[in-house]
Interface confidence: low
């Protein structure tokens, strides 16, 4: 008859590092004592009659184990293999591009430190949860690789790598080993600079909007924009409406930056640059600036009008000409009453880059005179019927404004000058009308003739 | 919201002036060129002219340089338009446009002031 | 001065079509600017820097060219658009003007 020696539990699976209780049984009636012959770590737990059970600790790797015993002078075994499994230590994927160009392939790469048994670990590659690529680990570390496509759907999706120990089949599940996620960041920059639309010419000290604009860029709101005059950067607003970034500033030039200046536009996304450039020409254009020598003259004295204004510049007085740009225009004259509420224009030009600007100035002089009293103005013989409406209409003219008044001859009595008024026959008579300032007075007879009407 | 608020209709006779105000709210005046155009019933758009409110800088179409004046009161917010020497061909709907810089053109418009020149 | 021209100077279409509106300039500009006007109404910005959609413009709306000839198209006419539309210039001064197309229902 033949006897068996049994090994229990036949062919186990456990965890790295673990313990396993192991029973070595035979129906063979004289058998002596059981052993269990491994380089494991053991302890004998019990025995029995035609039994033993063993204690194997700090199980690290695969290993067969056997029990052999001796039963009627030879010897019977048993054995059992022992699989070990272990969870990768590391699973890593490589640092992704900083920024991928959208439409460019890109590698993602997969690190597996350690893991068993290699035949059913599995590495997986995957973009949130889509997988990309399935793959054995086979060397040690396994590195396991796919090439994917960027597209603009790829911006900020996490990219992750997975492990699989597959223990389904030795009724120990599926173990999952998943990697930090990283994310990638795709980009569409355009080969094409962007717009930069810019004044041609700006005043010093004065403001004027420039504004760059880019489309069909990719994230647009990941995009950083310089904006510059000269060397001087500008505080830019910039906005984002689908693929087109604008940036707008207001360019404001000092009296440092006058002439022949660029304006300067960088987009930068995704490492990558483009860049507009647009010449412009700072001016600085003062004036005109006209002068009176005697804002108020006293009649028959001298007045001198200049007019000037800054470098380059071409100023024109009362159509006469500097002798030179930069240079002032000068005329002289001999205030008189006519010249009293006269204006002096001057019209100044300046050239910049080929274009001609042009800003005009005047003054208003004042001339003080004598008063007067127009005798075309100012009738000195007047036939009024009695009680009758009339107007006595005298005009008189003066720097400062004469007062008016019109006194009978030999007495107090006052005709009202230039307002209607009933006459009756006390009118009769001469008036004295003195036209009187604080420059002097001036008087003119005037004769009024009132014609009695006729009695019922 | 930007606007521009124009004054009344005027009826002037030949040979006058008239003097069209432009209320500008809602933006920075001194930082867009206010610009004046006018229509002639029936007609297309003709540009009197424009300024910097910023520097008083004018510039006007030859057209009416020597009959039109374009002022601004920054003080109030408000641009000026004067056309002098009226004569009945004058006749048209004034109106005063922003300057939205060379991005966006003539991009807010005030409502219309028709001046008519009659004797 | 510039002139600019636009043709037709007046147009009949109807509900959906696609229309066409030229301009041409007498000398080379950067950039042209379209405009809508209705009776009785202030003109509208519709499109900036030849091509350009101005805010709230619909996109049936759309403007090219380079030089000296410029077009405004509405790919599908709707009931709104009927009105006179101006393109203009501003490369030199004075600005200019196009004489205007009207586009009228059928």
């Known amino acids: 008859q033949e006897f068996l020696l049994r090994v229990e539990p036949q062919n186990p699976v456990l965890s790295a590092g673990g313990s396993l209780f192991v029973n070595c049984s035979t129906d063979c009636p004289s058998s002596e004592k059981i052993a269990l012959e491994t380089s494991l770590s053991k302890e004998l737990v019990a025995s029995g009659m035609g039994w033993a059970a063993f204690n194997l600790s700090n199980v690290t790797g695969n290993s067969r184990i056997l029990c052999s015993v001796y039963c009627n002078g030879s010897q019977i075994t048993g054995s059992s293999n022992i699989t070990v499994y272990r969870l990768p230590e590391r699973v890593e994927l490589a640092p992704l591009p900083p920024w991928q160009p959208v439409g460019q392939n890109f590698t993602l790469r997969c690190q597996v430190e350690d893991g068993s048994p290699r035949t059913s670990l599995t590495v997986v590659l995957l973009r949130w949860e889509e997988e990309l690529s399935r793959q054995p680990a086979v060397e040690e570390p396994a590195e396991v690789t796919a090439t994917v496509l960027a597209s603009r759907d790829d911006h900020g999706a996490p990219f992750s790598c997975r492990t699989e120990l597959d223990m389904q089949p030795q009724g120990l599940g599926l173990f999952v080993n998943t990697s930090a996620p990283r994310q990638l960041r795709t980009f569409v920059l355009p080969v094409t600079p962007p717009r930069l639309v810019a004044p041609r010419f700006l005043e010093v000290e004065t403001s004027w909007p420039v504004d760059c604009t880019l489309d069909g860029l990719f994230p647009a709101s990941e995009a950083q924009v310089y904006l510059a005059l000269g060397d001087q950067m500008l505080n830019a607003t910039v906005m984002n409406h689908g693929d087109t970034l604008t940036a707008t500033a207001t360019a404001t030039a000092r009296a440092d930056q006058e002439g022949a200046r660029e304006i300067v536009c960088n987009v930068t996304l995704g490492g990558e640059r483009r860049e507009a450039r647009e010449n412009l020409t700072v001016f600085s254009f003062l004036g005109p600036i006209v002068n009176l020598s005697e804002p108020t003259a006293h009649e028959g004295s001298t007045v001198t009008v200049s007019c000037m204004a800054g470098a380059r510049v071409q100023v024109t007085l009362d159509g006469v000409p500097a002798a030179a740009p930069g240079q002032p225009a000068q005329l002289q004259l001999n205030a008189t009453e006519s010249d009293d509420g006269r204006s002096f224009f001057c019209s100044a030009t300046l050239e910049v880059d080929g274009e001609f600007l042009h800003r005009n100035s005047s003054v208003q002089l004042r001339v003080l005179y004598g008063p007067k009293i127009d005798r075309a103005t100012c009738p000195q013989h007047l036939k009024w019927k009695d009680k009758t409406r009339h107007v006595l209409q005298c005009q008189a003219r003066g720097n400062p404004y004469p007062e008016l008044r019109c006194l009978k001859e030999g007495s107090s009595r006052e005709v009202p000058v230039g307002i209607p008024f009933f006459v009756n026959v006390t009118h009769n008579g001469t008036y004295q009308c003195q036209a009187s300032s604080s420059r002097g007075k001036y008087t003119l007879v005037v004769v009024m003739d009132i014609e009695a009407g006729s009695s019922h | 919201q930007v606007q521009l608020v124009q004054s009344g209709a005027e009826v002037k006779k030949p040979g006058a002036s008239v003097k069209v105000s432009c209320k500008a709210s809602?933006?920075?005046?001194?930082?867009?060129?206010m610009h004046w155009v006018r229509q002639a019933p029936g007609q297309g758009l003709e540009w009197m002219g424009y300024?910097?409110?910023?520097?008083?800088?004018?510039e006007y179409n030859q057209r009416f340089q020597k009959r039109v004046t374009i002022t601004a009161d920054t003080s109030t917010s408000t641009a000026y338009m004067e056309l002098s020497s009226l004569r009945s061909e004058d006749t048209a709907v004034y109106y005063c446009a922003r300057w939205g810089g060379n991005s966006y053109g003539l991009d807010y418009w005030g409502q219309g002031t028709l001046v008519t020149v009659s004797s | 001065d510039i002139q600019m021209t636009q043709s037709p100077s007046s147009l009949s279409a109807s509900v959906g079509d696609r229309v066409t509106i030229t301009c041409s300039a007498s000398?080379?500009?950067?950039?042209i600017y379209w405009y809508q006007q209705k009776p009785g109404k202030a003109p509208k910005l519709l499109i900036y820097l030849t091509s350009n959609l101005a805010s709230g413009v619909p996109s049936r709306f759309s403007g090219s060219g380079s030089g000296t000839d410029f077009t405004l198209t509405i790919s599908s006419l709707q009931p709104e658009d009927f009105a006179t539309y101006y393109c203009q210039q501003w490369k030199s001064i004075p600005l200019t003007f196009g004489q205007g197309t009207k586009l009228e229902i059928k």
């Open positions: 809602g933006y920075t005046f001194t930082v867009y060129w």
């Open positions: 000398s080379s500009v950067s950039y």
């Open positions: 300024i910097n409110p910023n520097t008083d800088y004018t």
